[in-house]
């Protein structure tokens, strides 16, 4: 008789990141017998769900099931059938749904209810759909990148197995930029966290961490743009908005009703003598930067120091991983290299924003126009947020590492979320068996 290969003793987990602009499904895999080891879980698949974020389905909840089908079917393909029933599925919704909940708890619940019913129809072990807090989003992003960078491992190695490893156990801070919110999370140096809301205490692998985190709702790149447009149209003399954050020659018609649809623009809302206005790009980095700065209130701070809008921020400490839209935008602009100084980034942004729209479309044929048109704004916004918002300087800029993936897994909150919910990050250091780290040899 022929020898049968022993079945691979692995486990799988699925996390859906229901973001403000879109939903992505991540599939993770790990060896069953090494659940408590650090760094063993890795991403095997990412599937981007076609269409907008789930909050946009508020008036058409009946379409949610079909919306999730393609990626859930992909998960069914990737994960062996014998493992389906024991594979947990989690859905975490972020700032898009936080905003919807602010407008109507009932509508947000209805969307989540339909999502739950749809996901329950698959052969996996569905564990629920919920709106995660901004604090969780920051914390899980921090856990993800430090887990993948091997920062929780007590083993010291004479060689680096992951990028950015400085061969010490000092954790990286996490900078996450989404469409509707942005998070900053790090371990401050011997600094008391002056606002309890921003303080987290973890015990991971036998070590205590006092972590600062804050999530700025409405300061993701898409909502920041809506805020900026709402602010600028207040002072426009007619239905033409000459906007320095878009390329010269770019034109786009915006409905006033769309502008005021989000709670993020409420503070700028006013009765306008028109239903639509036209953005006309003029492509000027400096003016765009100035306009963006007006979104950050730095005049009020009840603490020893603040980021903006009166939110406590301790002095920055150590290296930071900047991921999600921080990475996607800077990657497109070719500005992720460690060698590119902040001054060089600013210089490149000035040149990029000044390029005519027709030229940009030709140079970047194949890049979806919606995204292409907004890179000038997004790049300028990232610089403004990091420098004026979080107080990075030309010198500390080199401590920001723009990270897409670490060891093949996307940087983001989803892995940390799953590690936590599956109890795969122990509070104490697991007893090491003689062979548990033979892979280092």
């Amino acid at each position: 008789t022929q020898n049968k290969a022993l079945p691979e003793n692995v486990k799988y987990g699925i996390v859906l990141d229901a973001g403000s602009s879109h939903t992505s499904l991540y599939i993770y895999k790990w060896p069953a017998e090494k659940e408590n080891d650090t760094g063993v879980v890795h991403q095997v698949e990412e599937c981007r769900v076609k269409g907008p974020g789930i909050s946009k389905f508020v008036q058409k909840v009946n379409e949610i099931g079909i919306y999730l089908t393609d990626c859930m079917e992909r998960a069914r393909e990737v994960i062996p059938r014998s493992q389906h029933q024991e594979t947990p599925v989690y859905l975490g919704a972020t700032a898009g749904m936080r905003l919807l909940r602010m407008e109507s708890e009932e509508l947000a619940d209805r969307v989540l209810d339909v999502v739950e019913r749809s996901l329950s129809n698959y052969p996996f072990d569905f564990q629920g759909a919920r709106i995660i807090t901004g604090q969780e989003e920051g914390a899980y992003g921090w856990i993800t990148i430090n887990y993948l960078l091997g920062k929780f491992s007590q083993k010291t190695r004479w060689f680096s197995i992951v990028p950015y490893e400085t061969n010490n156990q000092e954790t990286f801070g996490a900078l996450d930029l989404g469409g509707a919110s942005t998070q900053v999370t790090f371990v401050p140096q011997n600094q008391t966290i002056e606002s309890p809301d921003n303080a987290l205490q973890f015990r991971l692998y036998g070590k205590d961490y006092n972590v600062y985190t804050h999530s700025f709702l409405c300061y993701g790149k898409d909502q920041a743009l809506w805020q900026k447009l709402a602010k600028d149209i207040q002072v426009a003399s007619n239905e033409i908005l000459r906007d320095p954050c878009f390329h010269p020659g770019y034109k786009k018609v915006v409905n006033v009703s769309d502008l005021y649809k989000t709670p993020c623009t409420k503070r700028f809302e006013m009765t306008l003598p028109f239903q639509q206005f036209e953005i006309q790009g003029i492509g000027n980095y400096q003016q765009c930067h100035q306009s963006i700065l007006e979104l950050f209130n730095t005049s009020y701070c009840p603490y020893s120091q603040c980021a903006f809008n009166g939110i406590f921020l301790p002095p920055l400490q150590g290296d930071f991983g900047a991921f999600s839209a921080f990475y996607f935008v800077m990657k497109f602009l070719n500005l992720t290299s460690e060698k590119v100084s902040q001054e060089k980034v600013t210089e490149m942004m000035k040149k990029f924003c000044a390029q005519p729209w027709e030229e940009i479309k030709t140079s970047y044929a194949g890049v979806k126009e919606k995204y292409l048109s907004e890179y000038c704004f997004s790049g300028t916004y990232i610089l403004s947020l990091l420098l004026q918002g979080y107080h990075f300087t030309a010198d500390s800029w080199e401590h920001i590492h723009f990270i897409g993936k670490i060891q093949g897994s996307d940087a983001g909150w989803t892995l940390g979320y799953m590690l936590n919910l599956t109890n795969m990050i122990p509070a104490e250091q697991p007893l090491s068996t003689p062979l548990s780290h033979s892979t280092y040899v």
């Epitope: 879109h22 698949e45 990412e46 599937c47 981007r48 769900v49 076609k50 269409g51 907008p52 379409e63 079909i66 393609d70 990626c71 079917e73 992909r74 069914r76 393909e77 479309k361 044929a365 194949g366 890049v367 979806k368 126009e369 919606k370």
Partner: antibody, heavy 123, light 107 residues
């Protein structure tokens, strides 16, 4: 090279069932989606449905429960069956390949089409 | 279902001319739009996907633009082999839907 070829009956009686086979070469049915689209004089190009690389199906609800798509991967064949035919179902039936890009969320782009199977529904 | 409206339904142009064909979606489809060329008796050929990405092997005189609800296909310096019917298709939502087509002839 990549090819898809439809074979069908040509003429079908009203109320009868239409069966078309799409035989593919140059790619694997387990890596691509196979879509069905028809072109009728009354409605132009109409998307009918598809079978995913994993074997699950998606249908246009306009065809209600009349339509079924299946496959035999060992023979590199995809099958379309549609019952209760009417004269309005007369047209050309195409199978086409769809390369799903999961990372980008791009699926539904038909990059290679078969030559089409002409179907006339008449008594 | 998302309705895709193409204009014009037919048009005549001279060799070497630039031609524009419009496609309007009944709701926002982001950039999930493809353009196909169909010649009589032949199967459709993919030209453009994601609104503006040129399919491999398609001449660079073809270009697509637009996002949201308004899209256009541009043919620079029209050649005789471009005489065909052009269709747009959205693939953001099921059921996928096609425009009614634009028949392009030589003047």
């Amino acid at each position: 090279q990549v090819q898809l070829k439809e074979t069908g009956p040509g003429l079908v009686q009203p109320t009868q069932t239409l069966s078309i086979t799409c035989t593919v070469s140059g790619f694997s049915l387990t890596s691509y989606f196979t879509q069905w689209v028809r072109q009728t004089p009354g409605k132009g190009l109409e998307w009918m449905g598809f079978i995913r690389s994993g074997g699950s199906t998606q249908y246009n609800s306009a065809f209600k429960s009349r339509l079924s798509i299946s496959r035999d991967t060992s023979k590199n064949q995809v099958f379309l069956k549609m019952n209760s035919l009417k004269t309005e179902d007369t047209g050309v039936y195409y199978c086409a390949r769809d390369r799903p890009d999961y990372h980008d969320g791009t699926y539904g782009v038909l990059d290679v089409w078969g030559q089409g199977a002409s179907v006339t529904v008449s008594s | 279902d998302i309705r895709m409206t193409q204009s014009p339904a037919s048009l005549s142009a001279s060799l070497g001319e630039t031609v524009n064909i419009e496609c309007l979606a009944s709701e926002d489809i982001d950039s999930d739009l493809a353009w196909y060329q169909k010649k009589p008796g032949k199967s459709p050929q993919l030209l453009i996907y994601n609104g503006n990405a040129l399919q491999n092997g398609v001449p660079s005189r073809f270009s697509g633009s637009g996002s949201g609800t308004h899209f256009s296909l541009k043919i620079n310096s029209l050649q005789s082999e471009d005489v065909a019917t052009y269709f747009c298709q959205q693939y953001i939502n099921y059921p996928y839907t096609f425009g009614g087509g634009t028949k392009l002839e030589l003047r």
